[in-house]
């Protein structure tokens, strides 16, 4: 069996996870891509996905997750903003290619989020603050990922909206350089 490797990201609450998953440009540029959490003994759970076909440089926001697919560079950028301790876990980027099994990109991401303010004086983390303007997505960010997407008759209430509204802003505070530590299973 192939050994799956992990990259460990250690961050503090409020920080942003910023992952770039590479893919083969010619094969997968327009394929739908997704961000999943791996749960022990359970099927991976898709937390967010790009549209189908995937649009170039078109951010899709689902809660605190932002996906951007850069076709020109063959990479999927995944950001999880305002990290919470409960976000800790094992994640992966995948490409959907039914009828085949989803194709895993990159190494799996072992995210460890700890409590504590990251921007304290004397800390050697480069704490920065950015405001990202997320353009509104034109379609609901559903991830059926299958040949017959289902219809939705009612969008969730605004407090649980899946996609950004026009001119929505995401404050990315304490974005730091991340130490990546490969971990082998």
């Amino acid at each position: 069996a192939t050994k799956l490797t992990e990259e460990k990201y250690e961050l503090k609450e409020g920080q942003t996870l910023d992952v770039k998953c590479d893919y083969t440009l010619e094969k997968f540029a327009s394929s739908q891509k997704a961000w999943q959490i791996i749960r022990d003994g359970e099927m991976p759970k898709t937390l967010a996905c790009t549209e189908r076909p995937s649009k170039n440089s078109h951010p899709v926001q689902v809660g605190r997750i932002i996906l951007e697919d850069y076709h020109d560079h063959g990479l999927l950028r995944v950001r999880m903003v305002n990290l919470q301790v409960e976000d800790s876990g094992l994640y992966q980027c995948v490409i959907y290619q039914p009828p085949k099994e989803p194709h895993m990109l990159f190494d799996r991401i072992r995210l460890v989020v700890t409590k504590g303010f990251s921007g304290t004086p004397g800390s050697n983390e480069n704490s920065t603050q950015n405001v990202y303007k997320i353009p509104p997505t034109t379609t609901k960010a559903l991830c059926p990922l299958y040949t017959s997407p289902r219809t939705v008759t009612q969008a969730p209430p605004k407090s649980t909206a899946d996609v950004s509204t026009p001119d929505s802003e995401i404050n990315l505070t304490n974005v730091t350089d991340i130490i990546r530590v490969p971990v082998f299973n």
């Epitope: 359970e42 759970k45 059926p144 990922l145 299958y146 040949t147 017959s148 969730p156 649980t160 899946d162």
Partner: antibody
Framework: QVQLQESGPGLVKPSETLSLTCAVS?????????WGWIRQPPGKGLEWIGS???????YYNPSLKSRVTISVDTSKNQFSLKLSSVTAADTAVYYC????????????WGQGTLVTVSS | DIVMTQSPDSLAVSLGERATINCKSS????????????LAWYQQKPGQPPKLLIY???TRESGVPDRFSGSGSGTDFTLTISSLQAEDVAVYYC????????FGGGTKVEIK
């Protein structure tokens, strides 16, 4: 539209293996989704047994895992359930359903088949 | 396992009146990263399989009448039938998929 139909023996003896098959029509199993089994003892609630992807990846209810095997036959567009070492407590209506792992729900369902465990 | 507790066990409501069913999970079924509650509601009529009504706690499945609505977040959820119709007589189940799929015990809705 998508339809599912369970089939298999309605009576199984204690300690034997329960075997059921779910035939899917109106949708190719290979096109996606997981495919699951759920059971309902007479007059009681629902219990998820397990789910399978067309590639063969399986996920089981931890409380049943040691006795359950779910398999898929894409050429026949069907998937199957085997539950070993059955007792009277396994008497139930067994349903198969399409399992949408993103929406985390089951839809549609088969009509169900009653399996009685008795000697 | 996450335990799903439904209340009441049964409910008798007059035609045209509101029916409210509660579902409480032993731990949160919310993934805060994507702000989704992994909770679904089903309707099961006598002699029939369950039918999906609501997923993600509040999103109605296609074709489900708008008198059915779901609300709640975290551990406490509600299914509301705003104006009970005769065809709504059934048992209603909640189901979570935050951690290994489990169902509530069901709530039987009858006409008063």
């Amino acid at each position: 539209q998508v339809q599912l139909q369970e089939s298999g023996p309605g009576l199984v003896k204690p300690s034997e293996t329960l075997s059921l098959t779910c035939a899917v029509s109106g949708y190719s199993i290979s096109s996606g989704y997981y495919w699951g089994w759920i059971r309902q003892p007479p007059g009681k609630g629902l219990e998820w047994i397990g789910s399978i992807y067309h590639s063969g990846s399986t996920y089981y209810n931890p409380s049943l895992k040691s006795r359950v095997t779910i398999s898929v036959d894409t050429s026949k567009n069907q998937f199957s359930l085997k539950l070993s070492s059955v007792t009277a407590a396994d008497t139930a209506v067994y349903y198969c359903a399409r399992h949408d792992d993103y929406l985390s729900s089951f839809d549609p369902w088969g009509q169900g088949t009653l399996v009685t465990v008795s000697s | 396992d996450i335990v799903m507790t439904q209340s009441p066990d049964s409910l008798a409501v007059s035609l045209g009146e509101r029916a409210t069913i509660n579902c409480k999970s032993s731990q949160s079924v919310l993934y805060s990263s994507n702000n989704k509650n992994y909770l679904a509601w089903y309707q099961q009529k006598p002699g029939q399989p369950p039918k999906l009504l609501i997923y993600w706690a509040s999103t109605r499945e296609s074709g489900v009448p708008d008198r059915f609505s779901g609300s709640g977040s975290g551990t406490d959820f509600t299914l509301t039938i705003s104006s009970l119709q005769a065809e709504d007589v059934a048992v209603y189940y909640c189901q979570q998929d935050h951690s290994f799929i489990t169902f509530g015990g069901g709530t039987k809705v009858e006409i008063k």
